[in-house]
Structure formats: C-alpha cells, structure tokens
C-alpha cells in the first residue's frame, strides 16, 4: 500500500513539475525590466526564450520572435536546449510511469517489469528536473552578469547633458516557475526510485511448504504461516487467506510479496 502511494504521489508530483517546466519554457517573462532606481517609463520590457515583448502603459503589448538561430547568444541556445531536453525526458518518463503504476493492470505484466519501468521513469524525472534547474540557473547567472555590467554603465554620458538610460533586466516569473517545477520533477523522480525498491520482488529462502497426506495429492498449508523447504526455487511467498486445501499447481503462482498485510 505504501509503495503504491509513493509511486502514485511521485507520478503526480512529476506530472505537475513537467507541466511547470513546459509552462516556464513557453513563458515570456524570463527576464523583466528592472524598475528599481530607474526613471519611470511608460514602456515595460520583458523577454522569454523565444521572443521579447514590450507592454505600454496604454495596455498595448507587442511581442517579437527571435527569428534567427545563429544570431542568438550561445547561452540562450544552451538554455533552450536544456529546457527542451528536460521536457522530452519528462514526457517520456510520464509515458513510461503510466504503464509502471501499480494501480494499473496491463495484461500479465510482472512486478519486476513494473519495478524496472518505475526506476527508468524515476531516473528520467530526476534528469528532467536537473535539466530544468540547470537551464533556469544558467539564464539567471547570465542575467546577474548583465545586470551588474549594465549598472556599471547605466548612465552613458553623451555630450555632457544628454544621457542614455540603459535598460536593466532582472529575474522574471518564469525563472521561479522553472526552479519550482524542476524541483518538483526531481522530487517526483526520487519518489519513483524509492517506490521501485519496494516494487522489486526479492528472492528469499522462504517457500511455501506442501504437506502430503498419504494417498491424497492435496497440499495442506496452515493459514498465516510461512513454512519452508529447500526445494521449489520458483515458488514465492503466498498469503493463505483460508486454511483450505490447494492443488500443487497453485503453489507455483507469482503474487507480489506486498500482498502480505
């Protein structure tokens, strides 16, 4: 039960995280015009990974896409790549984890397969989260560097009296969305990996024992006991819900060890 909850929660947290990463990647507010200690303008500038926008006090907003690939800063390209890799890995991870969910039965998929899939999706979520955090952090670092550079040259004197106010940019909402989303995806991935450990069927020395009554081919298994013999390496621990008789064939079934209450 705890494993199912951990896996389910990990999936939901990762789902929210990846939705957040997608939202952050699409958002225009990666960097916003710094208003502190600046003359008040009727125009507000903000920029995203894909376009830059200008919002005027009148309410008119104009956005322009970056219609060049080669002309863009390498750092911006790197951030774009990291975010896209994060989304792709996260999406694949979600797809894999849906089939890995314990609460979903798909054919006769074994627990070992589900455990592997859970681990795979967990690792994917972790890498996805790290990509998003890295992408956002690289962009934030770029902003900080540019901010202090533009602060140093904030007022460039032109002929003494005339001044040019350089637009400084600070952290936009998308950065915080990206950090939180990356963190959630990472946490979801860790939860999936923890759930995987609980899902993995462990080979133990405890086997079901068959008591053969003379002249009868019936196996008597007292309920609630885990007896063992050294034989039948394929047999797995089986909860006996009633103390009734079972056939020998039934001893060869493969229920999960988590069916124990």
């Amino acid at each position: 039960m705890a494993v199912t909850a951990c896996q389910g929660l990990g999936f939901v947290v990762s789902l929210i995280g990846i939705a957040g990463i997608i939202a952050a990647t699409c958002m225009d507010q990666w960097s916003t015009q710094d208003l502190y200690n600046n003359p008040v303008t009727a125009v507000f500038n903000y920029q995203g990974l894909w376009r830059s926008c200008v919002r005027e006090s009148s309410g008119f907003t104009e956005c322009r896409g970056y219609f060049t690939l080669l002309g863009l800063p390498a750092m911006l390209q790197a951030v774009r790549a990291l975010m896209i890799v994060g989304i792709v890995l996260g999406a694949i991870g979600l797809l894999v984890s849906i089939f890995a969910l314990k609460c979903i039965r798909i054919g006769s998929m074994e627990d070992s397969a589900k455990a592997n899939m859970t681990l795979t999706s967990g690792i994917m979520f972790i890498v996805s989260g790290l990509c998003a955090i890295a992408g956002v952090s690289v962009f934030a670092n770029m902003l900080v560097t540019n901010f202090w550079m533009s602060t140093a040259n904030m007022y460039t004197g032109m002929g003494g009296m005339v001044q040019t106010v350089q637009t400084r940019y600070t952290f936009g909402a998308a950065l915080f969305v990206g950090w939180v989303a990356g963190g959630l995806t990472l946490i979801g991935g860790v939860m999936m990996c923890i759930a995987c450990r609980g899902l993995a069927p462990e080979e133990t020395n405890y086997k079901a024992v068959s008591y053969h009554a003379s002249g009868h081919s019936v196996a008597y298994k007292p309920g609630g006991f885990k007896a063992s013999t050294g034989f039948g390496s394929n047999t797995k621990n089986k909860k006996i819900y009633d103390g009734g008789a079972r056939t020998e064939d039934e001893v060869q079934s493969y229920p999960s060890k988590h069916d124990y209450v």
């Epitope: 015009q33 003359p39 008040v40 303008t41 009727a42 125009v43 500038n45 903000y46 920029q47 830059s52 926008c53 200008v54 005027e56 006090s57 009148s58 309410g59 008119f60 104009e62 322009r64 005339v162 001044q163 040019t164 106010v165 350089q166 637009t167």
Partner: antibody
Framework: QVQLVESGGGVVQPGRSLRLSCAAS????????VYWVRQAPGKGLEWVAV???????NYNSALMSRFTISKDNSKSTLYLQMNSLRAEDTAVYYC????????????WGQGTLVTVSS | DIVMTQSPDSLAVSLGERATINCKSS????????????LAWYQQKPGQPPKLLIY???TRESGVPDRFSGSGSGTDFTLTISSLQAEDVAVYYC?????????FGQGTKVEIK
C-alpha cells in the same frame, strides 16, 4: 466619431478647489487612456496627468500633490480635481485621448478655461 | 524630469520652401525592447487645440499630409515640412512619450516669410 468635451472651468479664488469634467464619446474609457494637458495664456503645453484604461494614473510631479485625475467608466467621464489653486494654474485645460500604440494624443477636446484670481 | 529643447523658437519660411524643426531630449527616447522612439509632434493653430502629426518619431498620423515627416532617434529628432503651405502656419511641439511625466518642448512658431 470620437469626441471629448471639457466642462467645469471658470473663475475661482486662490486656495479654492475646482473639478473639471471631460465627457468622452465614440470610444470607451476601459479601452483607452485619457490625459489632461494645460496651456497658460500665450505659453506652451504642459502635461498634467493621465488615467489609463486599466485605471492606473500618472502625474506631473509638480502638480501631483494638488491635482487628482479619475474617471467614471459607466458615465464615460474623466475628471480632474484641482485643490489649493494658485494664480499660475490659470490656463486652458484640455483632455485628450491616447492613441493606444506608441503613446500619443490623437483626439483633443476644445478645452475649458480656468482662471484663478482674487 | 526629461527636458525637451526645440530649435529654433521661431522660423520664417517662404511658401513652397522646406521648414525644419529640431527637438533634443535630455535622455534617449529609444526603447531597446522594440527599437521604437517614443516621441510625438503636434501642430497648434491659434485658438485651436493641438493636432497630432507624427508619433513614434516618424509615423505619420492618418489624414496628415505627406509633406510632414519625422526623423531621428535616441535624443535628436527632426520635423520637416517639405513644401510649406499657408495653412501650415502654426506652433509645433515635440513631446516625450517615454518617461513620466510626459513633457513638451517649448514650441516652434512657423511663419511665412
């Protein structure tokens, strides 16, 4: 068509208050910003204040403490409340509409004269 | 506040001749985000309210004759009347539409020589 009609001007004593109105038609105040601009006799234009479509306001810092701009969207009317009036506030007061993109005043009223005199 | 300085204060030009008015702002009116200059030009005839001629430093308002043109960027702007007509006699104002408070130049009076 777009029309702006100012009213409320007149002769007022120094230190008193006056409220100017600007009736807007042909557009909605929820879609456009509207300005007050004044012009003292024989002088140039002086920007007073603006109320934007969303209700935000900006003022000429020299007048901010005494003048208040507001609007009533349902009545399509812009107001300028002027307190502690001085002789130097004597001017023709115009209201003008913002054009929307690139911030310029595309339609102007005929103006209302305010004379501050004892 | 941003100071807008127009030159000359008055200008006398013959009919059909070119009239040029300059406007200088104390800070750049060019917005880096969209590479637009937030400067407008107005014409005011005696006893009338101002009329918008040019916005965005160079875009002519609809209905304005094409003899009026605006140019310049950053801090230096120019209004040009390519062929002065009798009806162009007026006072012309430039206006900062970028920094609050929006400020006007002192005006340039255009007359016929």
């Amino acid at each position: 068509q777009v029309q702006l009609v100012e009213s409320g001007g007149g002769v007022v004593q120094p230190g008193r208050s006056l409220r100017l109105s600007c009736a807007a038609s042909g557009f909605t105040l929820t879609s456009y910003g509207v300005y007050w601009v004044r012009q003292a006799p024989g002088k140039g234009l002086e920007w007073v204040a603006v109320v934007w479509a969303g209700g935000n306001t900006n003022y000429n810092s020299a007048l901010m403490s005494r003048f208040t701009i507001s609007k009533d969207n349902s009545k399509s009317t812009l107001y300028l409340q002027m307190n502690s009036l001085r002789a130097e506030d004597t001017a023709v007061y115009y209201c003008a509409r913002d054009r929307g993109r690139l911030l310029a005043m595309d339609y102007w009223g005929q103006g209302t004269l305010v004379t501050v005199s004892s | 506040d941003i100071v807008m300085t127009q030159s000359p204060d008055s200008l006398a030009v013959s009919l059909g001749e070119r009239a040029t008015i300059n406007c200088k702002s104390s800070q750049s009116l060019l917005n880096s985000g969209n590479q637009k200059n937030y400067l407008a030009w107005y014409q005011q005839k005696p006893g009338q309210p101002p009329k918008l001629l040019i916005y965005g430093a160079s875009t002519r308002e609809s209905g304005v004759p094409d003899r009026f043109s605006g140019s310049g960027s950053g801090t230096d702007f120019t209004l040009t009347i390519s062929s002065l007509q009798a009806e162009d006699v007026a006072v012309y104002y430039c206006q900062n539409d970028y920094f609050f408070p929006f400020t006007f130049g002192q005006g340039t009076k255009v007359e016929i020589k």
